[in-house]
Every structure is written in structure tokens, then in C-alpha cells.
Amino acid sequence: SIPWNLERITPPRYRADEYQPPDGGSLVEVYLLDTSIQSDHREIEGRVMVTDFENVPEEDGTRFHRQASKCDSHGTHLAGVVSGRDAGVAKGASMRSLRVLNCQGKGTVSGTLIGLEFIRKSQLVQPVGPLVVLLPLAGGYSRVLNAACQRLARAGVVLVTAAGNFRDDACLYSPASAPEVITVGATNAQDQPVTLGTLGTNFGRCVDLFAPGEDIIGASSDCSTCFVSQSGTSQAAAHVAGIAAMMLSAEPELTLAELRQRLIHFSAKDVINEAWFPEDQRVLTPNLVAALPPSTHGAGWQLFCRTVWSAHSGPTRMATAIARCAPDEELLSCSSFSRSGKRRGERMEAQGGKLVCRAHNAFGGEGVYAIARCCLLPQANCSVHTAPPAEASMGTRVHCHQQGHVLTGCSSHWEVEDLGTHKPPVLRPRGQPNQCVGHREASIHASCCHAPGLECKVKEHGIPAPQGQVTVACEEGWTLTGCSALPGTSHVLGAYAVDNTCVVRSRDVSTTGSTSEEAVTAVAICCRSRHLAQASQELQ
Amino acid sequence: QEDEDGDYEELVLALRSEEDGLAEAPEHGTTATFHRCAKDPWRLPGTYVVVLKEETHLSQSERTARRLQAQAARRGYLTKILHVFHGLLPGFLVKMSGDLLELALKLPHVDYIEEDSSVFAQ
């Protein structure tokens, strides 16, 4: 019967008595930077070309016995997970292996860098189809390793890495912390985060998604027909590398940004038990388990968006946090969140010719997060319209006044330390979807975009008194681009998007002693692209 | 996933004004930085990745590496250039004493230096 991990990543339409999705990634080359591998294992023979690249440190210990099958164990298993004949994800993908880990599974940042450089030079000498690089390794945070990954990603290579097996914040490790890399955490057959001895999968905002990573059956280097079960975020990353190979084989022109958005979009949502993660990491960790798309073509009409959290600002009075989108994504909205509720909102601003989302801490606050909503919107022309604090009037308003521009997000930023001591604003009058409304002492920022066929609408859900959180979701066929809260009073901790749902968090009324008249409303801006929908229909 | 994550140790060594016999003095006001792994057992002192500024050509990387070796030799230190990077990042990998870091940080074109560290199969 089909192994649990292959069943988990397979959409129901492919599930027969065996795992055989269409097109096994045959147009894609997957580079594996790992241990040596047994390339003539029955599972992978003819699928893996062992390059002559080797850069490994000497094994530790004077009495270390170099046993070939042990030296090959990790890499052979991962090659099998990516492209194995019987237990692999992308059965048609061809692989190339580089040895950067020794027989104890240990390597160096410098050896990995030289390996990445080798791949880049190979790509320049002999350009082939799409390339996926699998990095099933982790070390401490490394500026240089992250920089090398960024350069390779900008050269059109898709990098997939293990989040790490340290039951810790993945942002403290490299290459897991590199923004351009697709970072993968591990889940088990029950969709729970994987525990590995006293440790387990890493988590946090540097993880893009999770994938099966416990009891994964794959090629064993113990013999040429052997299989073995292994666990770890390497196994999870290998699943995503395989899925990426299949997606790229079906659509070879996909950019890294498009691929990442699709991986997120087709993932199983909200199936992971977040209680396993430390409380302060739950909101930052994506609740996504990777899966193959239900069909290899035709996802192009979707408006894809993802949520990007910034690093924590730190607690100083003027501390700010910045969330950035990838180079070919559009920042369609910006929000902020603070566990203490002490924040001074957020704003979209230009930095290096690109919009970023900046959140501002407030005096006495423990720090803030900026949350960017990053979307794929071809031929988009977006700008930010700002209204300074209205002071005297009932509230500050700003709208998209340019012809053909639609509102995709609202942000508000204030200089006063605590808006809660001021009168709450009036809620936005109905029938004016293209405007943002906020507190009279706040400056309001509207993200206004023009793109072919783009249409947006506002959805609100309010509750009379704060009860922890209020949510509002976009319906099928619409994508959440903006998420904000009304009003901006002190009991609102912030707003953020989780998949297609806008979440507004507030302190419980019982702990704040607020009055019931302070209603909290979650405001979602939902968009779709008729242009993309028509384009995909014309292709079919 | 931000490059600004500050949870690794950063040692900033300001460039002193003394020329130290350099043909090309570094641009005024720039400060090369030194980075090392925050996890002490994973550090590999004695091997360093010297990363040069983005537009540095291979010939300049090689020249900078040779200059480091020459200046180190004048101080009685042996160094070994293990690899010259080009294609992804300009720079070089050098085996040397940590005593030479201050000297290396003053070399022209240097953006930052990172001490080598271990990575592990996951």
C-alpha cells in the first residue's frame, strides 16, 4: 500500500492503489548537497549523477571507522525520497549529488558555499531546464551562507532547505533563515510537528511550510534493495523538493515567487496542532502541510497571496520592524501586531524602490511585528495614499482617487502613545469600499493598485466587545489582500492574515475592563483578478 | 526570514586611519564587520570567509588575497588561501590566525568576514 507520506501529499484525484501522479518532474534537475550516496541503489539507479564535487571536513575522533553504508545513509535516503522509483515523490526527476557532509553527517559553511558556487558555474556552462537545489542541512545563522543562497535564487534556482531539528526558531539557523530559500519543517502521520528525541522540528516565521518528516520510507544504503525509515526536516525538505520538481516540470516558466505561492496555496491548511510550538511562536509559524496541486496546470488564474512576518522589533521606544515581500511580489497591505497591545501602528513606505511594511513600537511595549501581505499581481501599478491625522473631525479617511485603482489594504500609524485614551473613531460609512477610515489622531495609508481585471471588495465582521479575536474570511474565488482592525484602540493587539482569513486580536474584555461600546471589527479586503481568470480560460 | 536577524554574534572592528602600507586605502567611512557563529561548539576558528564588495572582480579578489598573505608574512604569520570565490559571491576562503582579523578587515574591497562554522545533516 502507498506509504503514509506519499498519500498525505497526494490530492484525492490521484489516489489509486499506488502513487502515480502525472509527470514525475522529468524536465527538472534536482541538486542534492549532502553525504555521499549509493547511486546504484535499485530505487535510484540511473536517476542520480554523482558529481566529482567533494568538500568535507575530516571525521571527528581518532577511532572513527569509515563504513561505506553509513557514509551514504543520509544522502541515499533523501535521493530516494525525492525521486525513488517506488517510494519517491518525483519519480521522473533526475538528480545530481554533491558531497558536502562527511560520514558523520557534518560539513562546513565554507564547503557548502563552494558547493553552491559549483552549481552556479555548472548552470552557466551548461544551461538546462529548471533547477532545484536541496540543502538538507543546517548550521548556526550565517550571513555569508544566506547571501550565497540569495544570489543563487536570483539566478533562477529554487532552493529548498530543512528548517532544522533543534525544536527552536528556524531564524537562528542557516540556510533556513535565508528569505529566498523555501524552508521546510516536519510533521508526522497525525499532522503533528515531529518530535526527535528531546528535540524536534524547528518552527517560526522563517519556516515557509511543513511536510512529512517522520517514519519516511526510503532507500537504505545497507544493501542495494533495502529500505529504511528515517525522520527529520531533511526528509520534509526532500518532499517539497520533489513537489517543486513536479510543479516546475508542468510549468517550467514558474518563478521562485510563483512556485512558493503555489506551494503555500495548495498546502493543507490548519491541520497542525499548534500547541506543540512555544506560545510566542504559534502566530508566526505557518499552519501548512505541503501537497501536490490537484492538477498540474491551470492554477494561473488565481490571485496568490501570502503573509510575511517581520523579525520582532525589540522593546525600545522607537523600535520598528520591517516586513518585505520577495522582489517579484507586490506588497498589497501592511498590518502590525504586539502581544502587549502597545504599538503605534504601521505604514507602507518605499525602500530601495520597493514598498515595505514598517510597524512601530510604543513606549512601554514589548515590541511589535510588521505583517506584509505579499501577492503575485502581474502588470500591477501600486501606490500608497496617505492622509495625515484629521485631528478635529470624527476620523481620518483616505481613498483611492486615481481612475482604475482599487483599494487592496489599509494601514494606520499614530504618534500618540495610546489611542485608547482618545475617543474611538466612527466606523466607515457603508457604500464606500475604496476608502480607509481610522482614528482622528492617526495617519491613514491606503494601498491602491491598478492591474488588469483587478476587483476588490470589503468584508467586515464586528463584535460588540473584544473577545480575544474576531475573524472575517474571503469567500471561494476571492483572495484576502488586506486585513485591519476598527477601531485602533488600546485593547486591539493587531491584525494579520492567516491564509484567506483576517484575524484581529484583542485583549479579553475581562482583563481590560473595557466597556461594551468599544466594538472591534475585523476588516478584510478581498480581491480577484478577472484578467488572470480569462487568460487561463483562453489557454484551456 | 530576514537578514536582519541579530541572533548571531557580530564583532564590528572599525577601520583605523593608519594606512598599514596599503596601496589602495579602503573607502573613507566604511566599516567591514566580522561575524561568527553564535553556537560556540559549531565555530571553526582559523578558517575565514572574506567577502568582498558586490562588484569586485575575480582579479581583485585574487589581488586582495595575495595582499593579505604578504602583510601577514611581514608580521610573521603563515596564511593559506584555500579557495577564491567568484560566480556567486566575490571573496576568498583563508586559513589564518585570528590575530590577523583586524588586518584583514582593513583590506580594500572587504565587505565582511565570517569565521567558518559547522553544518549538520538534518
Epitope: 492503489d17 549509493q38 546504484d40 539507479e45 540511473g46 549523477m49 554523482v50 517506488d86 544493501c223 534493495t225 | -
Partner: antibody, heavy 115, light 109 residues
Framework: QIQLVQSGAEVKKPGASVKVSCKAS????????ISWVRQAPGQGLEWMGW????????NYAQKVQGRVTMTTDTSTSTVYMELRSLRSDDTAVYFC????????WGQGTTVTVSS | QSALTQPASVSGSPGQSITISCTGT?????????VSWYQQHPGKPPKLMIY???NRPSGVSNRFSGSKSGNTASLTISGLQAEDEADYFC?????????FGGGTKLAVL
């Protein structure tokens, strides 16, 4: 091009041993092992075993285990299959083929066991 | 006694389609994606026609196709031609080895 070239025909007495060679060329040897398959006159194909060019590991079919030894000489890209204690029912054409997938075959070596 | 069962012979006229079956168990054909089909002309080595159930090596005519359902694999040859007359063998992985079918003699009438 990819080729497997086998040694010539052999006639052996019962109880003797035979050693057949197979020289591989035209591909990355370590990416594939070599399988040995035999075919008795007018009969079907029988898989005898496999050997790795990468590390010399072997996997023998139960039926010939104990009588067969497969070896490699990486310097000449050659694999050898030795069968001992020959019997008349070992009379067959012996083929080497690339890997478990057996996508490329040698021309065959006829081994006749007769007293 | 071969581990995989094939019909001893099948026949067809030029232009017709024929199917050869190969029945095993869940420990071989049913348990693996690696079912292969070989064509063998008299006095020649076998030639790989189908691998991994349904894949054709380059150079093999698209008249040859393979499929699998449960523990049975099938080879279909459409538009029969005189040169298709040969012996056909299936093979499959088992947990530690390889097994062949007994072979099917295809006669083109």
C-alpha cells in the same frame, strides 16, 4: 555509445567452474550495477544476481547462492561472474545487463556443461 | 516454474492490437512500480520495451504501451507488424531480487 561486451563461449565439464566477463562502457559506471541473467535452451529468463560498480556489494538469487561469485575490476570497467560446481542444467546463455532496470544487455555468452 | 505468469502464446493479424498479461502477487507486481517488458528475437539478447509499468525507452515505437492493475501488468501492442513476432517477457522487482515471467510467444498471422 552504451555497450556491454561479454567474453566468448565456454564448454565445461560437470563439477568445473566458469568465469564470464562483461566490459561496460559509454556511461557513468557507478550509477548502475550489473545484473546477470541466464536463459537455458528454449526456456525463459532467470535472474542470477547483481553487483555494484560503486562499492562491490552483491545481491545473489537464492537458487545460485553459494555457487556464484560476482566481482568487479574498476580499472578495466569489467565485471566477472564465476559459477562453480557446474551441472548440466547450468547449460545456458549467460547475459549481463545494466542495473536492475536491465535497459542495456550484453550479447550473451553460451556456456555448455557436458561430460 | 516462473514467479510471474504469462500466457504461453498469443497471436494477431497485422494491424490488430494484442495484449499480453503478466500476473504476480502483492509481493512483486502489485507491490512495486518497476514492471518491465522485454522483446527477444531468436538468437538475440532481450530488448527493453517498457519500464516502470508504462514508460517507453527512447527509440521504442509508441505502438507499445504498458499498464498495471493490482497484481497484473499488461503489455499492449497496437497496429501489429510482422517484426513484432518474438518472445515477450515481463519482469518485476521483489523485496530483494528480480523475477521474470515464463515468456509469451507472439505470432503475427
Amino acid at each position: 555509445q552504451i555497450q556491454l561486451v561479454q567474453s566468448g563461449a565456454e564448454v565445461k565439464k560437470p563439477g568445473a567452474s566458469v568465469k564470464v566477463s562483461c566490459k561496460a562502457s559509454g556511461y557513468t559506471l557507478t550509477s548502475y550495477g550489473i545484473s546477470w541473467v541466464r536463459q537455458a535452451p528454449g526456456q525463459g529468463l532467470e535472474w542470477m544476481g547483481w553487483i555494484s560498480f560503486y562499492n562491490g556489494n552483491t545481491n545473489y538469487a537464492q537458487k545460485v547462492q553459494g555457487r556464484v561469485t560476482m566481482t568487479t575490476d574498476t580499472s578495466t570497467s569489467t565485471v566477472y561472474m564465476e559459477l562453480r560446481s557446474l551441472r548440466s542444467d547450468d547449460t545456458a546463455v549467460y547475459f549481463c545487463a545494466r542495473g536492475y532496470g536491465m535497459d542495456v544487455w550484453g550479447q550473451g555468452t553460451t556456456v555448455t556443461v557436458s561430460s | 516454474q516462473s514467479a510471474l505468469t504469462q500466457p504461453a502464446s498469443v497471436s494477431g493479424s497485422p494491424g490488430q492490437s494484442i495484449t499480453i498479461s503478466c500476473t504476480g502477487t502483492s509481493s512483486d507486481v502489485g507491490g512495486y512500480n518497476s514492471v518491465s517488458w522485454y522483446q527477444q528475437h531468436p538468437g538475440k539478447p532481450p530488448k527493453l520495451m517498457i519500464y516502470e509499468v508504462s514508460n517507453r525507452p527512447s527509440g521504442v515505437s509508441n505502438r507499445f504501451s504498458g499498464s498495471k492493475s493490482g497484481n497484473t501488468a499488461s503489455l499492449t501492442i497496437s497496429g501489429l507488424q510482422a517484426e513484432d513476432e518474438a518472445d515477450y517477457f515481463c519482469s518485476s522487482y521483489t523485496s530483494t531480487s528480480m523475477v521474470f515471467g515464463g515468456g509469451t510467444k507472439l505470432a503475427v498471422l
